[in-house]
């Protein structure tokens, strides 16, 4: 009968040895068998399970010239870069005839310096703000003790007494380094050193101090910045996209923001070159030598209405008997708000001035008293918003109307030197 077919007679003449080493070690397990007839395929088991993707090589050497003679079969299993998952009991397995043979076991063990599964990471934190750091190490051999160090100084006096996997830091006032050390029966391993950069706290209480049609004055309260003085604060303003685009805490706005820097103190800034009667959102961040704070939430603000910056255009005034017909066009200059209407003033040489509110119409017919004998009649027009009257037009003399003639047009040449302002309610 072929060698190895009887249950009591194992074909194995060499069994796997033992390997114990540190992570990353490369080693080889070897088993040898002697069989009669065709050499079988050698399988490797780890903890009783066949290794499907084993890095193994099989060498077969005939001991005679006849293929029914004995063969020596050597199988080598290579373990590259030893890991915890490689540890366990290893055996060779062969199928001979209707029987299965398994070698004596060899053992692969892992034993070395602690290995970090998790190390502290670099991060930025606001001054005096609590945060956590994580560190995790394993053997074997176990147990593994951890020690946290801040700026190379141990944070506890005894293993088991200090924090282990998670370190809670109640707050820092200066940029610091943290690392952890892991110790087992093989020695000590040191983690990477994490740099925790202390940034200023987010400013608080961003608010409006005063408003003008094209400028806003804002102020805020700075947050703590640790041992690092604030160097400046940065304010951003953005058009509010119909008031819909930016909610509190929402990410960056769609438009390119208007950015201004304020030297500090004082924690106050005048934002100019804004559009009147326009909603904006503003936010602020403050910077130290370590970097910038986080931005405040977007604060909705609005510039107030202003008065129109120019008088109505193309005013014409013609007279026909006791009636005067006046018409004009909207000012070309910015209105700085919502146009509410026009005021008209007319005056004769020896008569008092008459003021009229025309509303939003751009023409008016005046009923002149008497038979129209008022001489040298002149008309002025001004546009107004909720903020008050814009500048008055230059006086336009009343022209006599002759049928068939075009009505004369008087171009506005220059503004009056002292336009009348009506200040808003705030």
């Amino acid at each position: 009968a072929p060698r190895g077919t009887q249950a009591e007679e194992s074909p194995f003449v060499g069994n796997p040895g033992n390997i114990t080493g540190a992570r990353g070690l490369t080693g080889t397990l070897r088993c040898q068998l002697q069989v009669q007839g065709e050499p079988p395929e050698v399988h490797w088991l780890r903890d009783g399970q066949i290794l499907e993707l084993a890095d193994s090589t099989q060498t077969q050497v005939p001991l005679g010239e006849d293929e029914q003679d004995d063969w020596i079969v050597v199988s080598q299993l290579r373990i590259t870069s030893l890991q915890l998952s490689d540890t366990g009991q290893y055996q060779c397995l062969v199928f001979l005839g209707h029987q299965t043979f398994v070698s004596q076991p060899g053992y692969v063990g892992l034993e070395g310096l602690p290995y970090f599964l998790e190390e502290p990471e670099d991060r930025t934190v606001a001054a005096n703000t609590p945060f956590n750091l994580s560190c995790q190490a394993q053997g074997p051999p176990e147990p593994v003790d951890l020690l946290w160090l801040q700026d190379a100084v141990p944070l506890a006096t005894a293993p088991g007494h200090g924090p282990q996997r998670s370190l809670h830091v109640p707050g820092l006032n200066k940029t610091s380094s943290f690392s952890c050390e892991a110790h087992n029966a093989k020695g000590v391993t040191t983690s990477r050193t994490a740099t925790i950069t202390v940034l200023p706290q987010q400013p608080r209480n961003l608010h409006l101090v005063s408003r003008q049609p094209t400028e806003l004055e804002v102020a805020w309260t700075p947050g703590l910045s640790g041992i690092y003085p604030l160097t400046h604060c940065t304010l951003q303003a953005v058009l509010s996209d119909d008031g819909m685009g930016i909610q509190a805490g929402e990410p960056d706005p769609p438009e390119e923001p208007l950015t201004s820097q304020a030297s500090v103190p004082p924690h106050q800034l005048r934002l100019g070159s804004l559009h009147p009667h326009t909603p904006y959102h503003i936010r602020v961040a403050c910077t130290s030598s370590q970097g910038p704070s986080s931005w405040t939430h977007w604060l909705p603000v609005e510039t107030p209405e202003g008065v129109p910056l120019g008088p109505p255009e193309n005013i014409s005034a013609t007279r026909n008997g006791s009636q005067a017909f006046v018409h004009w066009q909207e000012p070309r200059a910015p209105l700085q708000g919502t146009l509410l209407g026009y005021r008209l003033a007319y005056q004769g040489q020896d008569t008092p001035e008459v003021l009229m509110d025309i509303g939003l119409r751009q023409e008016v017919t005046l009923e002149l008293q008497g038979d129209g004998s008022v001489s040298n009649l002149t008309v002025c027009v001004a546009a107004y918003t909720a903020a008050g009257d814009g500048p008055w037009s230059l006086p336009v003399p009343l022209e006599a109307w002759r049928p068939g003639q075009a009505q004369p047009v008087h171009q506005l040449v220059k503004e009056p030197s002292t336009p009348a302002f009506s200040w808003p309610w705030w």
Partner: antibody, heavy 118, light 107 residues
Framework: DVQLQESGPDLVKPSQSLSLTCTVT?????????WHWIRQFPGNKLEWMGY???????NYNPSLKSRISITRDTSKNQFFLQLNSVTTEDTATYYC???????????WGQGTSVTVSS | DVQITQSPSYLAASPGETITINCRAS??????LAWYQEKPGKTNKLLIY???TLQSGIPSRFSGSGSGTDFTLTISSLEPEDFAMYYC?????????FGGGTKLEIK
């Protein structure tokens, strides 16, 4: 204050076992730290022998591994050294100590002198 | 095992002087070297660990430096009570090993 005190025989015959006790006061050996045995040979050479960790696990110097055993009695707050098959080469002053973390030994006993001789 | 070579083995100095003791490791031990003081009738005293960390309660005239393989203990402005035996010990890996010692005597 933490104190460690070694005790045991002054004289041991070759091939016998050397047994020493370290009694700790002022700190529980199960709370933290590792608890060590060190010896100093005539001529001042120091040798670290091994420790028992507060968890109960042990770690020995490979040069002594086949002969050394460190155990403890937590109820008495004591830990023990047993060194088997001693020879005259084991004549030394034996110290017990506590390690500061895994850095170094921050508390030592006074030491006990043991002579191996027939 | 890591071999530790300590030098000098003997040193004579006067109070007020500054002295240095050196230890060299046979391979890198990172920063993990400790220094001890031994005096007759007293328990051994830990002075420095992790190369340069001063143990609590030790006067600041003791300082340690070095990393890798070369380390130094410096005692500045020697006091009469500093004359003793000094040892270094690596605590980077087991088995922990010690230097051969330096005897500091009054000149």
């Amino acid at each position: 204050d933490v104190q460690l005190q070694e005790s045991g025989p002054d004289l041991v015959k070759p091939s016998q076992s050397l047994s020493l006790t370290c009694t700790v006061t002022g700190y529980s050996i199960t709370s933290a730290y590792s608890w060590h045995w060190i010896r100093q040979f005539p001529g001042n050479k120091l040798e670290w022998m091994g420790y028992i960790h507060y968890s109960g696990s042990t770690n020995y110097n490979p040069s002594l591994k086949s002969r050394i055993s460190i155990t403890r009695d937590t109820s008495k707050n004591q830990f023990f050294l047993q060194l088997n098959s001693v020879t005259t080469e084991d004549t030394a002053t034996y110290y017990c100590a506590r390690s500061l973390w895994f850095y170094a030994m921050d508390y030592w006993g006074q030491g006990t002198s043991v002579t191996v001789s027939s | 095992d890591v071999q530790i070579t300590q030098s000098p083995s003997y040193l004579a100095a006067s109070p007020g002087e500054t002295i240095t003791i050196n230890c060299r490791a046979s391979k890198s031990i990172s920063k993990y070297l400790a220094w001890y003081q031994e005096k007759p009738g007293k328990t051994n005293k830990l002075l420095i660990y992790s190369g340069s960390t001063l143990q609590s309660g030790i006067p600041s005239r003791f300082s340690g430096s070095g990393s890798g393989t070369d380390f130094t203990l410096t005692i500045s402005s020697l006091e009469p009570e500093d004359f003793a035996m000094y040892y270094c010990q690596q605590h980077n890996e087991y088995p922990w090993t010690f230097g051969g010692g330096t005897k500091l005597e009054i000149k």
